[in-house]
């Protein structure tokens, strides 16, 4: 009203020709014409808070956020961005208005967020809030959906800022656990952005376009369910919206729900309640806790209490950057030829990972399952008992993770032989890696029992075929054995396999293959 200073908030877009870092400034660069941001007094704020219309900026663009103050006398000011204070140098224009500017050069993701300007004048103190986000200009993107309260209605809107425009659907389930799997008959899908029926057991929103499908689950605490052994944990990045639903059912309406963060009631405007009668005339109440854009200080234990149920809590952790926590040490496994076995990786990650399993340069789809303790697990069982090296690779917007596995299949050796003018070689891929013996077949030893020890050269792991180790043994030809049949035998704990070779001319001459168990 007329007692308050007249505030004008403007955005100035600059032609990009500067490469220095963003700074608070009193003299902005040469630019395009200023855009009015309709500064409005924020309703029901403690203190005088003006908010500028939301600002969207292209990546690498340079802008100035500017405030013009029509108030008598001097002003002092302070900019605050992500809890850091930035200097502020007001000056006065030709109409004697106070001018305060914040220049952001070469806009990046880290410079997006809320900019607060605190102004102190001779008459009053007030705050101006600018919210700056990056315009999505990527060709094709698929972003994880997030929730927003429908403008002044008891309904949630599901939004996925993706290109091309994704198809958004709500995936609802009213039963517990395994029966809420995607293909289950208990699952109902609604291809719409707005959801009014918010009382269900499990609520997810999914967005899909040419790049695939991404889903976000509405984090829920159910006071009628036995609490998990470990406290449920919810991770969010700074600037993301927080939504937690607390649900309780009681025989009648005589109960209430409340949210607390670290034993302090949530501020009004950060929660809303809905209630309905179920088919058996019991009362269902849900209480949403929400923060439209979280900051570090929104971290903590959120507790939902009821006058008729034991309270339950969830730990909300706000991080600056996404992460993937898992042990990356390589793991070796040996299994029998028909043994059932799956590789598995247990990890904690935020945002949700995209992952692949790779074997022999071929990638396989990767499934993840959430565990009760906040960890997730990915299993790979489709190895078809092929020995070798398997790679698990995971990534999200901020982190990457790779883990190697070696699979060895216990089996009797199988021998392949080849001979040249100067030597004979035998190869085997059995596991455990076999040991070798060479024997000479002669009139004196028709059963080939005369052992050859001279000129033998064994090499374990001669070549690695996609992680599959091959053992070889080479016999150098000498006059003593030229023209004779020789037998190479590979043996391990599961058996022996032999190959007989005639040592008279080059070329492979597998003569007889013996399989001695």
């Amino acid at each position: 009203n007329q007692d308050l200073p007249v505030i004008k908030c403007v955005l100035i877009n600059h032609k990009n020709n500067d490469s220095s870092v963003g700074k608070s400034s009193s003299y902005p660069m040469v630019s395009e014409s200023p855009e009015d941001l309709g500064c409005a007094l924020r309703p029901q704020s403690s203190g005088t808070v003006y908010e500028a219309a939301a600002v969207e900026v292209d990546v690498s663009a340079s802008i100035t956020l500017q405030v013009l103050v029509d108030a008598p006398g001097n002003i002092s000011c302070l900019w605050v961005f992500k809890h850091s204070s930035l200097n502020c140098q007001p000056h006065f224009d030709l109409q004697n208005r106070g001018v305060v500017s914040m220049v952001i050069l070469k806009m990046t993701e880290t410079q997006a967020g809320e900019y607060l300007l605190f102004i102190q004048s001779e008459a009053t103190n007030y705050t101006i809030l600018f919210t700056v986000s990056i315009r999505n200009t990527l060709l094709y993107t698929l972003r994880r959906p997030y929730f927003r309260k429908m403008e002044n209605q008891d309904a949630l809107v599901c939004i996925s800022e993706s290109v091309p425009e994704p198809i958004v659907e709500w995936v609802l389930c009213d039963s517990q656990g395994e029966s809420c799997k995607e293909e289950s008959p208990a699952v109902v899908k609604k291809e719409e952005k707005v959801l009014h029926e918010l009382f269900g057991t499990d609520i997810r929103c999914c967005a899909r376009n040419e790049l695939g499908r991404e889903c976000t689950r509405l984090f829920t605490i159910d006071l009628n369910q036995t609490p998990q052994t470990t406290l449920p944990q919810l991770f969010l990045k700074v600037g993301e919206p927080l939504w937690i639903r607390c649900k309780a059912v009681h025989v009648n309406h005589g109960f209430g729900l409340t949210w607390e963060l670290e034993n302090k009631a949530l501020e009004e405007g950060n929660y809303f309640e809905m209630s309905t009668y179920s088919t058996n005339r019991t009362m269902i109440r849900i209480l949403f806790a929400f923060v439209s854009s979280v900051a570090r200080n929104d971290t903590g234990y959120y507790t939902c209490s009821s006058s008729k149920h034991p309270s339950q809590s969830a730990l909300v952790t706000i991080v600056e950057k996404g992460f993937i926590n898992a042990t990356n040490s390589s793991e070796d496994y040996e299994i029998d030829q028909y043994e059932e076995f799956c590789f598995s990786v247990r990890f904690k990650a935020y945002p949700q990972i995209r992952c692949t399993w790779t074997f022999s340069r071929k990638s396989f789809p990767c499934e993840q399952k959430g565990l009760d303790n906040g960890y997730s697990i990915s299993k790979f069982c489709n190895h078809k008992h092929q020995p070798g090296e398997y790679i698990f690779h995971a990534e999200n917007d901020d982190a990457q993770f790779t883990k190697m596995f070696t699979l060895n299949i216990r089996r009797k050796p199988q021998v392949l032989a080849e001979a040249s003018a100067s030597q004979a070689s035998c190869f085997s891929d059995g596991y455990p890696l076999p040991s070798w013996t060479w024997k000479k077949c002669s009139d004196k030893s028709p059963n080939c029992t005369e052992e050859i020890t001279e000129g033998v050269w064994n090499r374990k792991a001669n070549r690695k075929v996609f992680g599959q180790w091959v053992s070889s043994s080479t016999l150098n030809m000498s006059e003593a054995i030229k023209g004779f049949l020789v037998k190479c035998c590979a043996y391990n704990s599961l058996g022996t396999s032999c190959e007989t070779i005639l040592l008279n001319s080059p070329g492979p001459f597998p003569f007889i293959q013996d399989n001695i168990s």
Partner: antibody, heavy 127, light 107 residues
């Protein structure tokens, strides 16, 4: 300074299509959730909200006139266009465009109605 | 759609009078209501938004109150320049809707 200026024919015949243009300055139609509404007022009668369009191309129309209205924008020209088909003498009115700033962040937008209006353009429907 | 009912449709008052205009919504709209003033031949001008927040530059004799379905605009001491028609607008859910106006004229 924010200004909105309506332009279009002052006279249209019944059954014809009316095309009105709102040219804006002092703010950008491409900025986050900045919107423009069309409102009309028949002579001596109430204000009637017709339609809006936001920077992300989100649109909404008056329920009773939905089938006849189309709203679009050309950000590069800073223009919002409203077309109304099958005009009738009862559509004689002053047509206004007005700005709707969207407040909030990446994830949560809210509105406080129209803050700045154009001066209006009078349209008469008569044969 | 949400219907907005304004009353009275017109009133006569003198300079210095305290004037109250009411607006009723057909369903709860929280505090998502704006008040506009319109003078003959001119475009409407926003006085109040969010039911009770006075637009910057608007005289402090104008005030708004209410929440849910019942709202009021009060002019504490009517001035000559306040003779005009006043409209309420719900900006709670689309389609937005106006009340049909209250004309304040000189007694």
């Amino acid at each position: 300074q924010v200004t909105l200026k309506e332009s279009g024919p002052t006279l249209v015949k019944p059954t014809e299509t009316l095309t009105l243009t709102c040219t804006v300055s002092g703010f950008s139609l491409s900025n986050a959730r900045m919107g423009v509404s069309w409102i009309r007022q028949p002579p001596g009668k109430c204000l009637e909200w017709l339609a809006h369009i936001f920077s992300n191309d989100e649109k909404s129309y008056s329920t009773s006139l939905k089938s006849r209205l189309t709203i679009s924008k050309d950000t590069s020209k800073s223009q919002v266009v409203l077309t109304m088909t099958n005009m009738d003498p009862v559509d004689t009115a002053t047509y206004y465009c007005a700005r709707i700033p969207g407040y909030g962040g990446n994830f949560y937008y809210h509105y406080y109605g129209m803050d700045v209006w154009g001066q209006g353009t009078t349209v008469t429907v008569s044969s | 759609d949400i219907q907005m009912t304004q009353s009275p449709s017109s009133l006569s008052a003198s300079v210095g009078d305290r004037v109250t205009i009411t607006c009723r919504a057909s369903q709860g709209i929280r505090n998502d209501l704006a008040w506009y003033q319109q003078k003959p031949g001119k475009a409407p001008k926003r006085l109040i938004y969010a039911a009770s927040t006075v637009q910057s530059g608007v005289p402090s004799r104008f005030s708004g109150s209410g929440s849910g379905t019942e709202f009021a605009l009060t002019i504490s001491s009517l001035q000559p320049e306040d003779f005009a028609t006043y409209y309420c607008l719900q900006h709670n859910s689309f389609p937005w809707t106006f009340g049909c106006g209250t004309k304040v004229d000189i007694k």
